[in-house]
């Protein structure tokens, strides 16, 4: 017997927002939260907020981490509050870059 | 070069079952969304799903939830669409598309397949 | 369901001319929306996503505008090759839906 396929209950989740995309609010609302790290011009970049569509934060999520970049991606309210994303290299930090919060 | 090469024809009768494959080249097919589609003839687009290859989500629109069943074997970067209980109504042609992130759309699409339901 | 509405059904033109076809969103969609070309027996072709930005290797003479529910897609300049049908897509929410497509035809 074939399994039963799961019914999709498609929703939006209010996420933490952090960056430039985010103007002047500090939240979104979208069907996935995220948290990004990235490298640019020799800072740490850290950004949170929300994919909108389901299908773009899959894609984006399921790009794995690379040297210069990471986000990490959940499903649910405030889920990405306490989630910092990491680069793949545990404990050490790349030469000539600093911590910088894009606010 | 991306290509999605579609398999033949098919002509099947009522209430029979019908699997279709799409086959990858120049890409792996766990890196994108492999999405379906149908087009009856003189007829619109329908969108059926999609499936993630990677870890096998599925999205189904409703119209198709009891129809479709998209699988995949990444093995042999194939994926498939399989149509049950089939009636006049499924005779059309079944778009594969691949979904990417750089226009997050259907980018590349197969050259199709014909299905044919009459007994 | 995001019902999509798009005008006119068909449409002649001459060589040369411009053609403006329109996409209704029964809710807002963002800029969410892909308009695709498909000659017969041929799979749809991607000419334009996120309403307004051009796929790569179209030509410039097909352009997308809009935002939220209405939206427009325009050819300059037909050429021969144009004459095909054209359809708009929304991908924000599931189940993903098209337009009833616009079937352009030689004057």
């Known amino acids: 017997v074939e399994d039963e396929k799961p019914k999709v209950n498609q929703k939006l989740y209010m996420c933490v927002c952090e960056g430039l995309s985010c103007g002047n609010e500090d939240h979104c609302e979208g069907q996935q939260c995220f948290s990004s790290l990235s490298i640019n011009d020799g800072f740490h970049v850290y950004q949170k907020g929300c994919f909108q569509v389901y299908e773009q934060g899959k894609m984006t999520c399921k790009t794995p981490p690379s040297p210069g970049q990471a986000v990490e991606c959940c499903q649910g309210d405030w889920c990405n509050r306490n989630i910092t994303a990491q680069l793949p290299t545990k404990g050490k930090s790349f030469p000539g870059t600093q911590n910088f919060h894009l606010e | 070069e991306v290509q999605l090469q579609q398999s033949g024809a098919e002509l099947v009768r009522p209430g029979a079952s019908v699997r279709l494959s799409c086959t990858a080249s120049g890409f792996n097919i766990k890196d994108s969304l492999m999405h379906w589609v149908k087009q009856r003839p003189e007829q619109g687009l329908e969108w059926i799903g999609w499936i993630d290859p990677e870890d096998g989500e599925t999205r189904y629109a409703p119209n198709f939830q009891d129809k479709a069943t998209i699988t995949a074997v990444t093995s042999s970067n194939t994926a498939y669409l399989q149509l049950s209980s089939l009636t006049s109504e499924d005779s059309a042609i079944y778009y594969c598309?691949?979904?990417?992130?750089?226009?997050?759309?259907?980018?590349?699409w197969g050259q199709g397949t014909s299905v044919t339901v009459s007994s | 369901d995001i019902q999509m509405t798009q005008s006119p059904a068909s449409q002649s033109a001459s060589l040369g001319e411009s053609v403006t076809f329109t996409c209704l969103a029964s809710?807002?969609?963002?800029?969410?929306l892909a308009w695709y070309q498909q000659k017969p027996g041929k799979s749809p072709q991607l000419l334009i996503y996120a309403a307004t930005s051009l796929a790569d290797g179209v030509p410039s003479r097909f352009s997308g505008s809009g935002s939220g529910t209405k939206f427009s897609f325009k050819i300059s300049s037909l050429q021969a090759e144009d004459f095909a049908s054209y359809y708009c897509q929304q991908l924000y929410w599931t189940p993903w839906t098209f337009g009833g497509g616009t079937k352009l035809e030689i004057k």
């Open positions: 809710q807002t969609i963002g800029t969410w």
């Open positions: 598309a691949r979904y990417t992130s750089r226009y997050y759309t259907m980018e590349y």
